[in-house]
Amino acid sequence: QPPPPPPDATCHQVRSFFQRLQPGLKWVPETPVPGSDLQVCLPKGPTCCSRKMEEKYQLTARLNMEQLLQSASMELKFLIIQNAAVFQEAFEIVVRHAKNYTNAMFKNNYPSLTPQAFEFVGEFFTDVSLYILGSDINVDDMVNELFDSLFPVIYTQLMNPGLPDSALDINECLRGARRDLKVFGNFPKLIMTQVSKSLQVTRIFLQALNLGIEVINTTDHLKFSKDCGRMLTRMWYCSYCQGLMMVKPCGGYCNVVMQGCMAGVVEIDKYWREYILSLEELVNGMYRIYDMENVLLGLFSTIHDSIQYVQKNAGKLTTTIGKLCAHSQQRQYR
Amino acid sequence: SAYYPEDLFIDKKVLKVAHVEHEETLSSRRRELIQKLKSFISFYSALPGYICSHSPVAENDTLCWNGQELVERYSQKAARNGMKNQFNLHELKMKGPEPVVSQIIDKLKHINQLLRTMSVPKGRVLDKNLDEEGFESGDCGDDEDECIGGSGDGMMKVKNQLRFLAELAYDLDVDDVPGNNQQATPKDNEISTFHN
């Protein structure tokens, strides 16, 4: 059956609506026209739309779609952005406290090792922070550097305090001896394992959250195709050309159109689901040595234990190092 | 044994945080985030439906627009694309995702792979064989995890983890998001270009 004639044979209602979209009336016909030049709202009879109006409707339809998409993702976007910021800051605070705990341990138990120990501890935790934020640093290197740097100070200040401060040559020998003689036992390796596991997990957790933001931002700012624009225009605006201002699109029709427009976006679904489930699995495993909070805040204690281990074996070590580094020590006393 | 007197806190504001018993730890905050994220697990598959429900669609009206004509809401014509001869929806779907979408899918695949490899194997949280040689006497037990915090009575208990810090206690409840009152849907007031 032919559509009912426009209730207003003068296109007055259409004009007053269109004026809100586009001030200036020159695009709206005074009275219904054949509309043979229309490409989207193909008329079955006289129409109150012109080609220019149709273009404006298409533009508006695509804009509406973008706004709807942004509104749809707002809650999710806020959730991830806020949490990414919170966790990043929380991790930095944990690192800061871990550094403070470790410095305090040195100050209380080994005051003669400060301020050198403070410097090494500070550098170590700087690398921890940088690693979490994605820097290409090797955890084993930073743990090795910590113990390599600490041992000469421990030896010259705690175990053999008679050596002069200027004993630079013996430092070279002591650094080498640290690993050769395993002076800290298995503690460096233990710390490497705990720190690398907990930091790796922390780093990937932050990376995953930041990628989540990127995913939402990408789909949030999609530009819809011309074909989609036409479909949306026909669904939302073509009825106006017939003067049907109060009519709304059918629900099923809307779903079909949206699925067409969002076919590409919906392809993300499978990987998005997997992303959330994989992230859940990761989070479920973030405890004990996979929990940086637990590992880093306990590090001062493990370092303390490692120094106690050196002290426990001091007699044996001093004799061995005395022989091993004899040449260096003699040079110092000349 | 090592001890940690509180007067040595370099960052004083932490003092009031470290002993708050009822604040969340980071791990509980992580789990809370996952629970909230899981409510968005169908976000992308549900998008078309979400957008339809938040844009003008005939709900209580008898008649609705099918792209070409006015039809009864429950008729077969209501779900059909009124101008199916003009644009092929199947063709639109066959075009495949935009390059930016393909790129983001690749990134998601990559992070998913990383997350899977990083996920802790079930049943065992740690590697038993830390080193070929066993610990010497006086070292930790063979479970490397036991090495955390074993230095005597005065030791700060690591189990009492850093509480989720006061300065970070943003309220993450989404109800408080500015402009995110779920009752005020775009259908009602957000998209000014719809005039019904």
């Epitope: 550098e123 700087t126 690398d127 930073m142 090795n144 550097e145 650094r175 | -």
Partner: antibody
Framework: QVQLKQSGPGLVQPSQSLSITCTVS????????VHWVRQSPGKGLEWLGV???????DYNAVLISRLSIKKDDSKSQVFFKMNSPQVDDSAIYYC??????????????WGQGTSVTVSS | DVVMTQTPLSLPVSLGDQASISCRSS???????????LHWYLQRSGQSPNLLIY???NRFSGVPDRFSGGGSGTDFTLKISRVEAEDLGIYFC?????????FGGGTKLEIK
């Protein structure tokens, strides 16, 4: 005392690779990193890369595809290799020991330098 | 990359004079950890560079106390209180706050 001695050819053709060996004494490669730097009249001093005590390496991003640094701890030797050298790679190449903390360190002892001319 | 600019290019002095060399970086060398990784080297004629000062103001082992370093952020200075003959050569500043490490173009200290 700490010493770094360099050896390598002075003249290299673009088709060959540029290889220099740095032999160290007075310290162990298992506890110190070794950097490579070059100096040319046109570019001044330019940091090329480093090999750490663990064997891990860091390179200058501009040259990463052409550089390789390896070492033999037991022989106290570090090996620097640059593939497809060009004329503007002609320079004096230095190895130097890392002092300070890893990549935030400095070179506290330097080799004597190897003058390299790339010419066809 | 961080660009290090040294002034002057050449500094003619008489022995016993004070000398001052300036080094400016294109971005701040203050690391997020509070340290500044700015170092000074001296290269005598026909020799390899030698470390003089590390982290702005710390003299390396064996370096005489007539050498002092100062500055912060992007502006740094090396001072020699009384120039001696062995101090002649080219002075380089270098930074390791940012990767890659970069060096200044050098300042040649020579006799007037």
């Amino acid at each position: 005392q700490v010493q770094l001695k360099q050896s390598g050819p002075g003249l290299v053709q673009p088709s060959q690779s540029l290889s220099i060996t740095c032999t160290v004494s007075g310290f162990s490669l298992t506890s110190y990193g070794v950097h490579w730097v070059r100096q040319s009249p046109g570019k001044g001093l330019e940091w090329l890369g480093v090999i750490w005590s663990s064997g891990n390496t860091d390179y200058n991003a501009v040259l990463i595809s052409r550089l390789s640094i390896k070492k033999d701890d037991s022989k106290s030797q570090v090996f620097f290799k640059m593939n497809s050298p060009q004329v503007d790679d002609s320079a004096i190449y230095y190895c130097g020991r890392n002092g300070g903390w890893l990549l935030r360190g400095f070179m506290d002892f330097w080799g004597q330098g190897t003058s390299v001319t790339v010419s066809s | 990359d961080v660009v290090m600019t040294q002034t002057p290019l050449s500094l003619p002095v008489s022995l016993g004079d004070q000398a001052s060399i300036s080094c400016r970086s294109s971005q701040s060398l203050l690391h997020s950890n509070g340290n500044t990784y700015l170092h000074w080297y001296l290269q005598r004629s026909g020799q390899s560079p030698n470390l003089l000062i590390y982290k702005v103001s710390n003299r390396f082992s064996g370096v005489p106390d007539r050498f002092s370093g100062g500055g912060s952020g992007t502006d740094f200075t090396l001072k020699i209180s009384r120039v001696e003959a062995e101090d002649l050569g080219i002075y380089f500043c270098s930074q390791s706050t940012h990767v890659p490490w970069t060096f200044g173009g050098g300042t040649k200290l020579e006799i007037k």
